[in-house]
């Protein structure tokens, strides 16, 4: 829930804004509805369509420590347990992420799907 002080001549000083709802599909341009007393407003907004948003913002996980290096694959892994999901995000209860054992090379963390349709 987002609250915003509006310094205008109206009696409404605090607007409460709902989520950004895409006009079509799951992302892109949409509207956000705000309420203040009996007043309502709709403002344009945008939900990003990139993978980072889908995984990073919709599904938040609490991770355990990294496991030992697996010599056969050259990777180490850790498990994450769902901490919080956006209301309509269909997040996995647990995920497993891996990364190369070497700490010298910075590479992107690979993960099994954080979201998935039933």
């Amino acid at each position: 829930k987002k609250k915003e002080k509006v310094k205008k001549g109206s009696e409404c000083s605090e607007w409460t804004w709902g989520p950004c709802t895409p006009s079509s599909k799951d992302c892109g341009m949409g509207f956000r509805e705000g309420t203040c007393g009996a007043q309502t407003q709709r403002v344009h907004c945008k939900v990003p369509c990139n993978w980072k948003k889908e995984f990073g913002a919709d599904c938040k996980y609490k991770f355990e420590s990294w496991g030992a290096c697996d010599g056969s694959t050259g990777t180490k892994a850790r498990q994450g347990t769902l901490k919080k999901a956006r209301y309509n995000a269909q997040c996995q209860e647990t995920i497993r992420v891996t990364k190369p054992c070497t700490s010298k090379t910075k590479s992107k963390t690979k993960a099994k799907k954080g979201k998935g349709k039933d």
Epitope: T21, K25, K83, K84, A85, N88, Q92, E93, G116
Partner: antibody
Framework: QVQLVQSGGGLVKPGHSLRLSCAAS????????MNWVRQAPGKGLEWIGM????????ILNQKFKDKATLSVDIAKNSAYLQMNSLRAEDTAVYYC??????????WGQGTLVTVSS | EIVLTQSPATLSLSPGERANLSCRAS??????LHWYQQKPHQAPRLLIK???QSISGIPARFSGSGPGTDFNLTISSVEPEDFAVYYC?????????FGGGTKLEIK
């Protein structure tokens, strides 16, 4: 699976307050949104609001902004609904439900609140 | 807020018949529409989530369609235990809202 057991309902006088409890057991209570819904006798379902136990983020139906307060106690795996300045029209069965978009939801058994002098 | 209108208010059928329940939203809500069944003195029970997604433990005779503004819950062949009140609910924007309900009664 999550089991939700509700308590705290009963007869209350107009103008008084009441705190309803929703105790969770089973799978992780703190990972899922907790909704509160009420149903007046012979009427439909009405959403009061929801709270996320992990950080207490609360989204309240504006209709209840001066009436309801939501809270959680992670240590007790419980969610609470405080209802203030109760009136006869607040007489209803109050439900808590734990929501996951992935698996669906689980509901408490409901608790009846009767506001009468 | 988004208004959900359910029709018919009452549906009278015999066991074995097909039931079609409608829920219309006042604006597009994508697929963020869920169906509940409620029997007297019981909490609601989720039947279908996100317009058409099945729920574990719910019989296959229950199915849903969407998305957009017009949604339907279909019971392919009504069983005696299906006579109850059915509610739709949207989770597209706050406040979450429910339809007024459809009562499925024995003919």
């Amino acid at each position: 699976q999550v089991q939700l057991v509700q308590s705290g309902g009963g007869l209350v006088k107009p103008g008084h307050s009441l705190r309803l409890s929703c105790a969770a057991s089973g799978q992780s209570f703190s990972s899922y949104w907790m909704n509160w819904v009420r149903q007046a006798p012979g009427k439909g379902l009405e959403w009061i609001g929801m709270i996320h136990p992990s950080d207490s983020e609360t989204i309240l139906n504006q209709k209840f902004k001066d009436k309801a307060t939501l809270s959680v106690d992670i240590a007790k795996n419980s969610a609470y609904l405080q209802m203030n300045s109760l009136r006869a029209e607040d007489t209803a069965v109050y439900y808590c439900s734990s929501w996951s978009a992935k698996r669906g939801d689980f509901w408490g058994q409901g608790t009846l609140v009767t506001v009468s002098s | 807020e988004i208004v959900l209108t359910q029709s018919p208010a009452t549906l009278s059928l015999s066991p074995g018949e097909r039931a079609n329940l409608s829920c219309r939203a006042s604006e597009s809500i994508s697929n963020n529409l869920h169906w509940y069944q409620q029997k007297p003195h019981q909490a609601p029970r989720l039947l279908i989530k996100y317009a058409s997604q099945s729920i574990s433990g719910i019989p296959a005779r229950f199915s849903g369609s969407g998305p957009g503004t017009d949604f339907n819950l279909t019971i392919s062949s009504v069983e005696p235990e299906d006579f109850a009140v059915y509610y739709c609910q949207q989770s597209n924007s706050w406040p979450l809202t429910f339809g007024g309900g459809t009562k499925l009664e024995i003919k």
